[in-house]
Interface confidence: medium
Amino acid sequence: TPLGPKWPEPVFGRLASPGFPGEYANDQERRWTLTAPPGYRLRLYFTHFDLELSHLCEYDFVKLSSGAKVLATLCGQESTDTERAPGKDTFYSLGSSLDITFRSDYSNEKPFTGFEAFYAAEDIDECQVAPGEAPTCDHHCHNHLGGFYCSCRAGYVLHRNKRTCSALCSGQVFTQRSGELSSPEYPRPYPKLSSCTYSISLEEGFSVILDFVESFDVETHPETLCPYDFLKIQTDREEHGPFCGKTLPHRIETKSNTVTITFVTDESGDHTGWKIHYTSTAQPCPYPMAPPNGHVSPVQAKYILKDSFSIFCETGYELLQGHLPLKSFTAVCQKDGSWDRPMPACSIVDCGPPDDLPSGRVEYITGPGVTTYKAVIQYSCEETFYTMKVNDGKYVCEADGFWTSSKGEKSLPVCEPVCGLSARTTGGRIYGGQKAKPGDFPWQVLILGGTTAAGALLYDNWVLTAAHAVYEQKHDASALDIRMGTLKRLSPHYTQAWSEAVFIHEGYTHDAGFDNDIALIKLNNKVVINSNITPICLPRKEAESFMRTDDIGTASGWGLTQRGFLARNLMYVDIPIVDHQKCTAAYEKPPYPRGSVTANMLCAGLESGGKDSCRGDSGGALVFLDSETERWFVGGIVSWGSMNCGEAGQYGVYTKVINYIPWIENIISDF
C-alpha cells in the first residue's frame, strides 16, 4: 500500500514492525511501497533494529528493494560475515520507488522487538556518477530539484537524446590552395552522434591532393566495413572510402578542384579521429625565360594556375610589347597551362636625336647617330660670338630616356651671345665727335617710332633704353621700329627687329624728372650675333672701379650734331665722368628744379663743353671698358642734359645702370 502524501507535498514518514516497540508476532508479512516524485529518490535509515538472527536471514528479515534490485536483506542486531544488520547505514532507492518487506517465520527462540525506520524523499543528483560509469552528459550537466539537464560547449548542439553533444561541424569551406582539416577535437576523441561535412573548393583548374597525417583512429568492426563511424571523400568524379580503423589511408590525388569530406559518428566509442593536410596542383605554365637585359621575379621552380611573374628590365632598358612601351609587366598562369600575356622585350632606352641648339651645334661622341642609353653627345656654341652658359655641353642618354647634362639638367644648354666685343681700340682723346667705323659699337640700336632714339642690345633678344624714349609706345610695342647692324641711320641695309613688349621702370614718372629713366624692350625674335651685332655687357659688381670721376666713357648715337641735324653716320664721343656733387650743383640753379640729379644718375662731359650727347641719342649706352675682362659694359643710358647740348658748365646726365641690375635681371628672367 502506498504511503506518504500525494505530490507535490513533501514525502517523508516512519515505518515500524507490527507491535513496535513491543515484540513482533510469528508469521507476519508486511510490505510498504514508498514512491517519490520523478527526479527524486528515497532515503531510509533505522533508529531501532532487533530481529531474529538466522543464516542468510532466512527466518525473520527486512528486505529493501528498488525496482528489480534487492538493496539489502537485514536481520539480527549486528552484522556478521554472512548476515547484515542496518546499524547506522542509510539506504537509497535506485529510482523514485522503494519497497520494504518485513517477514517473521513460525517461531522465535526469544522475543525480538522488531524495527523502527524513517524515510524521506530527496533530490537525485544525476550529475554525480560512480567512478567508471559513463557520465550523465557529454559536456555540461546541471542538476536541479527533481531532475537535470545537459548543455554543450560552443560549436556543439545537444542531440535529441538530450545527453549527447553533436559537433556543429558542417558548412566549413576551404578555399586556400593548401590547408589542414581534422575531426572535431583532434587529437582528443571526436564527438558522438555527429555528422560533419567539409568542403574544399578551389578555382577550376586546380586539383586537390589529400594527405592523411599524424594518426588515424576511427571506430571500426572486424567483419563489417565501417558500420559505426566513417570518413568519406567525394569529388565530382568519384567517391573514396568509407575509411575507418587505425591505418592512415594513402594519399588521394582527386584530380578535382572540389572535394567534399563527410565524417559520421555514432553514439559510442572513444577514438581520436583523423587529420588531413591538403595541397593543390595545376597544369604548370611554360617556364618563363627572361628577355635579354631583363629578369623574372619571383623565380619559382614552377608556375601553376594563378601564379604570376613580373619582368624587370636592367637600368637603361625599357619594357616593350611590340612597339608599345609598358610601365610594368605581369603575366598570370591560366588554367589551361598558358600565360595570359606574351613576353615583352627589354629594349635599350633611346633618347632619340638630340634637339638642335640655337647658335650652336651637337656632335655625336659615342658614334655616328648613336642615341641609346649611355651614349654621349657634345653641344658647343658658335665660336667668337657665343659662349655656353654654366654647362660644359656634355650630355648623356640616361635611363629615363632624356639627354642629361653632368649637372643633371634635362634642358638644352644655352648659347649666350658674347657681350662687349668691339673693333674699336680706345684712344685717349676726349674732344670732338668721331664717326664710328664698322664693329665699333655693335650693340648700338636705332629706335624709330615717332622720334629717333637709341638703345643697346642685351643678350640676343633684349634692348636697354631710356624710359622717356619709349614711353609713348609702352602700350603699343609693335609700333617700335628697331634697327641694328648698321652705321648709317638711313641705310636700307640693316637687321630689322620688332618689339614684343616694353617694360618701363615702375619708378619712372613721365614729365616729372628723369629719375629711374630706364626701360627694357623684349624683341619678338632672337637676333643673330655677328661682328656688327653684338650685345653690350651689364656691369659687374666691381664695375664702379672703372667709372670713377674722370674715367672715360664713350657715348654713341645718331643724335643732333653741332650743325643741329640728326647725324647720318653713327657718331661717338669719349667723355669723362664728372664728380657727382659738381654735376648736382650745376643743375641746382634755374631753370632746373632742385633735386634734378639723383643718386640713380651719373654725369659725363667737359666743363668747357663741346662734347656731349644730344637729342636723338636718348636711350643709347654710355660704355666703359672693363680692363680686367677686356669687354665693354654699359655704365649709363643717355637720359637728359642742358637745353643746349655741349653747353659749358653743364653736363650730360645718364641713368646709372649699376643701380638697376636686379631690376634688369628680374625682368629678363621672368619674361
Epitope: Q283, C285, P286, S338, P342
Partner: antibody, heavy 125, light 107 residues
Framework: EVQLVESGGGLVQPGGSLRLSCAAS????????MAWVRQAPGKGLEWVAT????????YYRDSVKGRFTISRDNAKNSLYLQMNSLRAEDTAVYYC??????????????????WGQGTLVTVSS | EIVLTQSPATLSLSPGERATLSCRAS??????IHWYQQKPGQAPRLLIK???RSISGIPARFSGSGSGTDFTLTISSLEPEDFAVYYC?????????FGQGTKLEIK
C-alpha cells in the same frame, strides 16, 4: 647524325610497372629538353611528359601525373620514363623525342624535332 | 586543355595537285603551332615550326601559315611520298596537345 634509341617496352599486367630508357647520340644532349610522346594502336599522337635540359623541371599530361616519372642522366646521355600503376589505356608505342630548346614569346615551349623509332608498351591481363 | 581540330579527316588527291590541310585551335595560340608527317610504321617527322617557319631538309613545297586560332599546312604540288598522316601540335600551353590528324591518301 642524331640518334634516339628507346628500350624497355613489353607486356605488363594492369597495376604493374615498367621503365623505359632512351639512349641519345649525335647531338649535345644537355642542350635539349627531352620528351616522351605516345601513340595508341591506330590512334593519334599524345604528348606524355617533358623534362627541361638541366633536369630542373618536369611537365606531365594529367592522366599520367603521379604514376609516371620522367628523368634524365646527362652524364650518360640517357632519358628515362618510370611507369607505375599501369592501366590498359596506357598501351601505346612510346617515342623518345628531343624538344627544341628554342623558346618562343619568352617561354620554354617546344616542338619535337628528332624522334626515336619507338618502343611498344602493352598493358593487359 | 587546348583542343586542336584538324580538317578534313581524310583528303584524297592525286600527285601534282595542291593540298591544303587545316588546324583550328579552341583558343588563340599565337603562332605556337607545329606540323608533323607520319608514315605507317615510322616515327613522326617535323615539317614546319611556329606556324610558318621552315625546317632544314624539308622540301620547299611544304609551307605553313596562320596565327591565333586558324592554321594551314600547304603542299604546293603533291609527290607520291607525301601521302601520309599529318598532325598539328600546339606548344602555347605547357600541356602540349596534338590534333587528331589528317590522312592524305592517293585518289
Amino acid at each position: 647524325e642524331v640518334q634516339l634509341v628507346e628500350s624497355g617496352g613489353g607486356l605488363v599486367q594492369p597495376g604493374g610497372s615498367l621503365r623505359l630508357s632512351c639512349a641519345a647520340s649525335g647531338f649535345t644532349f644537355n642542350d635539349y629538353n627531352m620528351a616522351w610522346v605516345r601513340q595508341a594502336p591506330g590512334k593519334g599522337l599524345e604528348w606524355v611528359a617533358t623534362i627541361l635540359f638541366d633536369g630542373s623541371r618536369t611537365y606531365y599530361r594529367d592522366s599520367v601525373k603521379g604514376r609516371f616519372t620522367i628523368s634524365r642522366d646527362n652524364a650518360k646521355n640517357s632519358l628515362y620514363l618510370q611507369m607505375n600503376s599501369l592501366r590498359a589505356e596506357d598501351t601505346a608505342v612510346y617515342y623518345c623525342s628531343t624538344e627544341s630548346p628554342y623558346y618562343s614569346e619568352g617561354y620554354y615551349q617546344g616542338y619535337f624535332d628528332y624522334w626515336g623509332q619507338g618502343t611498344l608498351v602493352t598493358v593487359s591481363s | 586543355e587546348i583542343v586542336l581540330t584538324q580538317s578534313p579527316a581524310t583528303l584524297s588527291l592525286s600527285p601534282g595537285e595542291r593540298a591544303t590541310l587545316s588546324c583550328r585551335a579552341s583558343q588563340s595560340v599565337s603562332t605556337s603551332i607545329h606540323w608533323y608527317q607520319q608514315k605507317p610504321g615510322q616515327a613522326p617527322r617535323l615539317l614546319i615550326k611556329y606556324a610558318s617557319r621552315s625546317i632544314s631538309g624539308i622540301p620547299a613545297r611544304f609551307s605553313g601559315s596562320g596565327s591565333g586560332t586558324d592554321f594551314t599546312l600547304t603542299i604546293s604540288s603533291l609527290e607520291p611520298e607525301d601521302f601520309a598522316v599529318y598532325y598539328c601540335q600546339q606548344s602555347y600551353s605547357s600541356l602540349y596537345t596534338f590534333g587528331q590528324g589528317t590522312k592524305l591518301e592517293i585518289k
